[in-house]
Interface confidence: low
């Protein structure tokens, strides 16, 4: 009993003075609590509590259930307590069959003991089975036994107190373990798409599947650099024991252009935290960009192939789409694809091939596209460059001789003579008149050179060579001459084509 | 000063075992996760091991499950790496890391300077 | 595990601004961080999260998170940026980390 110094309050005085009683069942409990300040009694076990005013508590019958603490407190908040045990040997045990632990923590599975002299006093898994060999625990007689450091593999895990009785093994009735996860990990957050794009009035709806080991992970929906809180709505499952799954999903009816902007998905729990964003992009009308993926004015040489490509984006997606040239449209020779199969892909690709292009097909490509909302188009001019072709080569009335060549780019002539029998031409010849001439072809087409010199100059036998040339190569046209006495005399011109 | 010093490495023959040592200074050693991350010559970096603070938490890289065992001694602000049955591909230079979470970031933020292992017969 | 994709190797011209650019699937739910490495050195943080700079890093550099896409950004390079460069992220699974196989970038 507690020793009193004056002028102090000192915590009541209990009979029988001891810390622990037992009693047997149908025996009667007597507890006489002496303080002049005495306020009340107070019984306790498991979650049960009971409360008597009068200084003297008396059970005639005692029972198992009146196992427990019993407390006598004064008015100045000090108290002293006894423990009675009511030995009942049909019933060891009294019990609270709820059983919860949370992860890396310690759990009590609360049998307390009507008999403080039973041995053995344990936990035996349910119909035989061994318990988890990792599994430690700490009985006391008073409050239960206490598993230390509960482990996930413990869940749903089937449980009996256990005692020693004259010999025999007596068991609680059973209890289930239901283990609490720790967060050992950030949550796992995705999201359905990582942009949108809608026009004004469309619908905007996103969901964020948030993964964790239980419920409590808490999570939301935000708006990058706001606090208004978004409507959500939540369906959630549970994969099993440690896999949960939510669903948060956001939708905004009619979305108008400010509603623009990035959403984050956030979640957290007691490890950390995780997030995902998602751009929403609302415009007032569908649009169509045209980027050439190459200059839009090509130079390309005769016979070979030239690809005309482009990459467009649309929204709504495109519907028509046409090559066009010289009011002709293409209907094979090109293709248009997506240029990634996501399906928020607005960016796509058109190419039309051109193959073994002659000197004729220069001329405006166009690429036209439409969706429902606008019309786009883009031109390519194509020039095909072609080595050039002597097209005449003429001694003129007036002694002139005159060449005239075609070709893209324009080709320059230059005139040499070979004087007497020399197969090599070097001396040059400066022309008296060039002029380029208007072409009837189209407007892309080979550009015409007209040269012209006088023949009066030479006074030897020999040849003339013109000699047309540009970027892709080069040709020559030879005219032969020879004087007859005091007459010259023309010899029919030949073109000798080098290479 | 803040350091992390790997030590252990060297020249075993496939199917042999190293214990690689890794000591920390300069911090609160045991609140911080920590990693093992190696570079194979001439190659890039790959994540091998990663254990939390409390050594409750430990993942590998598929490469090394079953083979490597990482572990800590926050009394000796030390990390190991215990590498079994070790094959001709995991010879790299192992970098210990510090490895941590802000806000949700992961990155590592405290390399040492590493320590070669050599597998070849 | 999901891997991260980079560029071998990258050459920007002295002061001029060049991109280095991760992809992966992991990359769509996790942030990427960045690290450079230089011969015979051990890596250095220079980028995490939302474009989060480490104290001690230039102010030229800068990151950048699209999609299933990560970029780190060198504005007005030096001759000292001269590096290997790794970005690196949780692995979808979200209990490995995952390396991209680096980008050599040179400094002309």
């Known amino acids: 009993q507690p020793s009193v110094s004056p002028g102090e309050p000192s915590p009541p005085s209990i009979h029988p003075g001891k810390s622990d009683l037992i009693v047997r069942v149908g025996d009667e409990i007597r507890l006489l609590c002496t303080d002049p300040g005495f306020v009340k009694w107070t019984f306790e076990i498991l979650d049960e509590t009971n409360e008597n005013k009068q200084n003297e508590w008396i059970t005639e019958k005692a029972e198992a259930t009146n196992t427990g603490k019993y407390t006598c407190t004064n008015k100045h908040g000090l108290s002293n307590s006894i423990y009675v045990f009511v030995r009942d040997p049909a019933k060891l045990f009294l019990v609270d069959r709820s059983l919860y632990g949370k992860e890396d923590n310690d759990t009590l599975v609360r049998c307390p003991l009507t008999d403080p002299e039973v041995t053995n006093y344990s936990l035996k898994g349910c119909q035989g089975k061994p318990l988890p060999k990792d599994l430690r625990f700490i009985p006391d007689p008073k409050a239960g036994i206490m598993i230390k450091s509960v482990k996930r593999a413990y869940h749903r895990l089937c449980l009996h107190c256990s005692v020693d009785q004259e010999g025999k093994s007596v068991l609680s009735e059973k209890f289930i373990l239901k283990v609490r996860p720790a967060f050992k990990a950030v949550p796992v957050v995705s999201v359905s798409k990582a942009s949108y794009l809608l026009r004004e009035g469309e619908e905007f709806t996103v969901t964020c599947t948030i993964k964790d080991v239980s419920s409590s992970v808490y999570s939301t929906w935000k708006r990058e650099n706001s606090q208004t809180k978004l409507q959500e709505k939540y369906n959630s499952w549970h994969h099993g024991d440690f896999n949960y799954e939510r669903q948060a999903t956001l939708t905004i009816s009619s979305a108008r252009v400010n509603d623009s902007g990035v959403f984050m998905c956030y979640a957290n729990n007691t490890f950390g935290s995780a997030n995902v964003t998602t751009t929403l992009e609302v415009v007032d009308k569908g649009f169509i960009n045209i980027f050439p993926m190459i200059n839009t004015t090509v130079f390309v040489n005769d016979g070979e192939n030239v690809d005309l490509i482009v990459e467009y984006e649309a929204f709504p997606k495109p519907e028509h789409q046409q090559w066009i040239y010289m009011n002709r449209t293409f209907t094979d020779k090109w293709e248009d694809y997506p240029k990634s199969e996501n399906e928020s892909n607005i960016r796509y690709v058109s190419e039309l091939h051109l193959t073994r292009l002659k000197g004729t097909e220069g001329g405006t490509y166009t690429f036209l596209v439409s969706n429902s909302d606008v019309n786009a188009a883009i031109a390519f001019n194509v020039y095909v460059n072609t080595k050039p072709e002597i097209l005449t080569y003429d001694r003129l009335v007036n002694g002139m001789l005159q060449c005239v060549a075609a070709g893209f780019p324009e080709p320059t002539i230059d005139w040499y003579f070979c004087p007497g029998t020399e197969q090599r031409c070097s001396a040059s010849v400066l022309p008296v008149d060039v002029q380029t001439l208007n072409s009837s072809g189209p407007p892309f087409g080979k550009l015409v050179v007209q040269s012209s010199i006088d023949s009066s100059a030479f006074k030897h036998n020999g040849t003339v060579e013109c000699k047309a040339y540009n970027d892709v190569g080069k040709t020559s046209a030879y005219f032969n001459f020879a004087f007859k006495g005091n007459n010259k005399e023309q010899i029919h011109p030949h073109t000798l084509f080098t290479p | 000063q803040v350091k992390l010093q790997e030590s252990g490495g060297g020249l075993v023959q496939p199917g042999g075992s190293l214990r690689l040592s890794c000591a920390a200074s300069?911090?609160?050693?045991?609140?911080?996760?920590m990693s093992w991350v190696r570079q194979a010559p001439g190659k890039g970096l790959e994540w091998v091991s990663y254990?939390?603070?409390?050594?409750?938490?430990?993942y590998y890289v598929d490469s090394v499950k079953g083979r490597f065992t990482i572990s800590r001694d926050n009394a000796k602000n030390s990390l190991y790496l215990q590498m079994n049955s070790l094959r001709d591909e995991d010879t790299a230079v192992y970098y210990c890391?510090?490895?941590?979470?802000?806000?949700?970031?992961?990155?590592?933020?405290?390399w040492g300077r590493g320590t070669l292992v050599t597998v070849s017969s | 595990q999901s891997a991260l994709t980079q560029d071998p190797a990258v050459s920007v011209a002295l002061g001029q601004t060049v991109r280095i650019t991760c992809q992966g699937d992991?990359?769509?739910?996790?942030?990427a961080s960045w690290y450079q490495q230089k011969p015979g050195q051990a890596p250095l943080l220079v980028m995490y999260?939302?474009?989060i700079r480490p104290s001690g890093i230039p102010d030229r550099f800068s990151g950048s998170s699209s999609g299933n896409s990560a970029s780190l950004t060198i504005t007005g390079a030096q001759a000292e940026d001269e590096a290997d460069y790794y970005c690196?992220?949780?692995?979808?699974?979200?209990?490995?980390?995952?390396f991209g196989g680096g980008t050599k970038l040179t400094v002309l």
């Open positions: 890391a510090r490895l941590r979470n802000s806000e949700g970031y992961w990155y590592f933020d405290l």
């Open positions: 999260g939302q474009n």
């Open positions: 690196n992220s949780r692995d979808s699974s979200y209990n490995h980390w995952v």
């Open positions: 254990i939390t603070s409390s050594s409750s938490t430990i």
């Open positions: 300069g911090f609160t050693f045991d609140s911080y996760a």
């Open positions: 992991s990359l769509r739910s996790y942030f």
